[in-house]
């Protein structure tokens, strides 16, 4: 079953996906698509990386993490109800049938009437200690740094535990890390 993530209309949605490159800069192609992962490739591709950089993107979809270190988590900006559905993160490991496939379910909720306080986060990369804010409503938050190696079963269990008490997208502070090589 898919791991569920939630966002409100007008916010940014965050769908986590990670792998560990075999060596620094030794990147693996990744595709993100709308719809469950098919046998090969991604259907309805919204973003794609190659061994060096992002080589295909669409306007509201971008990578907010350090993709060169294997953080290929997808940000969908300014979501609408139409963005609800299953998204596929496919890590295209060389070799026959070696790809890692992750199906993530995005649930978009109508915006709350009462605006929540804007959250913020610090960057530590090229913009040292950079503050990020959303112009309307809460910002997406993301923890950059080491991520625990946990399997999808653990994530699913954690999602079930959190679903009733916290937003499922709080899972962004954990992520499935695929080691390559």
């Amino acid at each position: 079953s898919e791991v569920e993530y939630r966002a409100e209309v007008g916010q940014n949605a965050y769908l986590p996906c990670f792998y560990t490159p075999a060596a620094p800069g030794n990147l693996v192609p990744v595709c993100w698509g709308k719809g469950a992962c098919p046998v090969f490739e991604c259907g309805n591709v919204v973003l794609r990386t190659d061994e060096r950089d992002v080589n295909y993107w669409t306007s509201r979809y971008w990578l907010n993490g350090d993709f060169r270190k294997g953080d290929v988590s997808l940000t969908i900006e300014n979501v609408t109800l139409a963005d609800s559905g299953i998204y596929c993160c496919r890590i295209q490991i060389p070799g026959i049938m070696n790809d890692e496939k992750f199906n993530l379910k995005l649930v978009i909720k109508p915006a709350k009437v009462t605006p929540a306080p804007t959250r913020q986060r610090d960057f530590t990369a090229a913009f040292p200690r950079m503050l990020t804010t959303r112009g309307h409503g809460p910002a997406e938050t993301q923890t950059l740094g080491s991520l625990p190696d946990i399997n999808l079963t653990q994530i699913s269990t954690l999602a079930n535990e959190l679903r009733d008490s916290r937003l499922a997208n709080d899972l962004r502070d954990s992520g499935a890390t695929i080691r390559i090589g």
Epitope: L47, T49, W57, W62, L63, N64, R68, E77, R134, G135
Partner: nanobody, 121 residues
Framework: QVQLQESGGGLVQPGGSLRLSCAVS????????MGWFRQAPGKEREGVSC????????SYPDSVKGRFTISRDNAKNTVYLQMNSLKPEDTGVYYC??????????????YGKGTQVTVSS
């Protein structure tokens, strides 16, 4: 051909303000994350602001937070940097930049040629 053309730089006294503009051509701005970088003499280029494709998400380092504001007008293919309460350490060449499909922390695809900002009394 992608072109980013900065304007609005100049000499200003400490405490003063400037508004930089970046005219974008050759790409669809609302599909790009845009940023402003600066480079002082003898120093590395550093990011001073970043804005997402729709303008809904912005970022600033502590050194300019509360003083600089980035904005964009996709209909006019223009990105702006409003700089208030300028300090001598803000002096440098300011570059407009664009990146496809990812946030600006991890490098940019395109840079303009820059506009000089000098803060001095």
């Amino acid at each position: 051909q992608v072109q980013l053309q900065e304007s609005g730089g100049g000499l200003v006294q400490p405490g003063g303000s400037l508004r930089l503009s970046c005219a974008v051509s050759g790409l669809t701005p609302d599909a790009y994350v845009m940023g402003w970088f600066r480079q002082a003499p003898g120093k590395e280029r550093e990011g001073v602001s970043c804005i997402s494709p729709s303008g809904g998400t912005t970022s600033y380092p502590d050194s300019v937070k509360g003083r600089f504001t980035i904005s964009r007008d996709n209909a006019k293919n223009t990105v702006y940097l409003q700089m208030n309460s300028l300090k001598p350490e803000d002096t440098g060449v300011y570059y407009c930049a664009a990146v496809a499909g990812r946030w600006c922390d991890y490098g940019m695809n395109y840079y303009g040629k820059g506009t000089q900002v000098t803060v001095s009394s």
